[in-house]
Interface confidence: low
């Protein structure tokens, strides 16, 4: 069951998923001037068995026409129910350290892959928060949000996570304002 | 306050195994991104494991496979299960608190592990 | 992995003296940084976070600067406390890593 909307949004902070449940889909999204090839599959899935999980399916971009018009590829209809930005950094990546049973670890990147990666997590993800540069953690409360089902709908738990700048008064709970543009988590995925 | 008290270290042969203890006061582990730290004359300053609130763990790869993290809620205490122990593993062990920036605020007084025959 | 080189290694400095120590990292890592204390037998303290950033309870003596590879810890004026072993760490990338610290001792 796909989870109907995003993570909370944390003011100053931001997620992170280190290890994808079974069942979440990943975008093949291209960089612009390419696109995904017509036999490629739309998404990757992650899929397993009770002792491995992987990515089906490879994402794969191809140069687009000579004139180079062709935007990044658009998700079908099905596929825009939940979309996850998170950026692509490096390849080290805190999931590539991380082995969890009925989950995968980040996909390796493919050539020519879009700068954002587009999720859709499923019930039962838990994504991670984190203050962004120069930001501390000033309730120290659960850091992470989990995509829970409750009587027939989906929703993600509240994270206890509040981070404040020295120079700035506290936010409160439930105040919300534009996210602070982050350096990103480290090499790891970072919400936009 | 917040305080971290180490205990469980000491002498062991290679292969051996040992259990470290982290018990915590003035917050509550299982909410917070906790670390097991390592620190030898030679290599400096390691991080070696970190359990995230969730339950997700992580190793170095010098003990990925021998170096157990976990943590009792009900005890607020962190642990780190060391088997297969080798002569490189001989250091102070810290445990510390990440405070959710990948910065360590607050660190045990350390327990000294010495893997010798 | 980001390998962090301090120079130097030690110094030698007198009470009231100004005191830089440098870390430099070996790609870039924008402003995650963070500097330690050590003292002989006890555990690092933070010091500075966010290359710049003080913590909580530190005196207003201790800076950071830098961004990109180079930083710099500066002591304005040294006090008899302050003699010990200084660690720089990145936060930008897994895994953590420290530099191999910088021994502070009185001349």
């Known amino acids: 069951e796909l989870c109907d909307d995003d993570p909370p949004k944390i003011t100053h902070a931001t997620f992170k998923a280190v290890a994808y449940k079974e069942g979440t889909m990943l975008n093949c999204e291209c960089k612009r001037g390419f696109r995904r090839i017509k036999s490629g599959s739309p998404y990757m899935l992650c899929t397993g068995n009770s002792s491995h999980s992987s990515w089906d399916n490879q994402c794969q971009c191809t140069s687009s026409a000579a004139r180079n018009t062709t935007k990044q590829v658009t998700p079908q209809p099905e596929e825009q129910k939940e979309r996850k930005t998170t950026e692509m950094q490096s390849q080290m990546q805190l999931a590539d350290q991380v082995s969890l049973p009925g989950h995968c670890r980040e996909p390796p990147p493919w050539e020519n892959e879009a700068t954002e990666r587009i999720y859709h997590f499923v019930v039962g993800q838990t994504v991670y928060y984190q203050c962004v540069q120069g930001y501390r953690a000033l309730h120290r409360g659960p850091a992470e949000s989990v995509c829970k089902m409750t009587h027939g709908k989906t929703r993600w738990t509240q994270p206890q996570l509040i981070c404040t700048g020295e120079t700035e008064p506290s936010q409160f709970p439930g105040e919300e304002e534009p996210q602070a543009s982050p350096d990103g988590l480290p090499e790891s995925e970072t919400s936009r | 306050e917040v305080q971290l008290v180490e205990s469980g270290g000491g002498l062991v042969q290679p292969g051996g195994s040992l259990r470290l203890s982290c018990a915590a006061s003035g917050f509550t582990v299982s909410s917070n991104y906790m670390s097991w730290v390592r620190q030898t004359p030679g290599k400096g300053l390691e991080l070696v494991s970190f359990?995230?609130?969730?339950?997700?763990?992580s190793y170095a790869d010098s003990v990925r496979g021998r170096f157990t993290i976990s943590r009792d809620n009900s005890k607020n205490t962190l642990y780190l299960q060391m088997n297969s122990l080798r002569a490189e593993d001989t250091a102070v062990y810290y445990c510390a608190r990440d405070d959710y920036s990948n910065y360590f605020d607050y660190w045990g007084q350390g327990t000294l592990v010495t893997v010798s025959s | 992995d980001i390998q962090m080189t301090q120079s130097p290694s030690s110094v030698s400095a007198s009470v009231g003296d100004r005191v830089t120590i440098t870390c430099r990292a070996s790609?870039?890592?924008?402003?995650?940084l963070a500097w330690y204390q050590q003292k002989p037998g006890k555990a690092p303290k933070l010091l500075i976070f966010a290359a710049s950033s003080l913590q909580s309870g530190v005196p207003s003596r201790f800076s950071g600067s830098g961004s990109g590879t180079d930083f710099t810890l500066t002591i304005s004026s040294l006090q008899p406390e302050d003699f010990a072993t200084y660690y720089c760490?990145?936060?930008?990338?897994?895994?953590?890593?420290f530099g191999q610290g910088t021994r502070l001792e009185i001349k």
């Open positions: 760490q990145q936060a930008k990338s897994f895994p953590i890593t």
């Open positions: 359990i995230y609130s969730g339950g997700i763990t």
């Open positions: 790609q870039g890592i924008s402003n995650w």
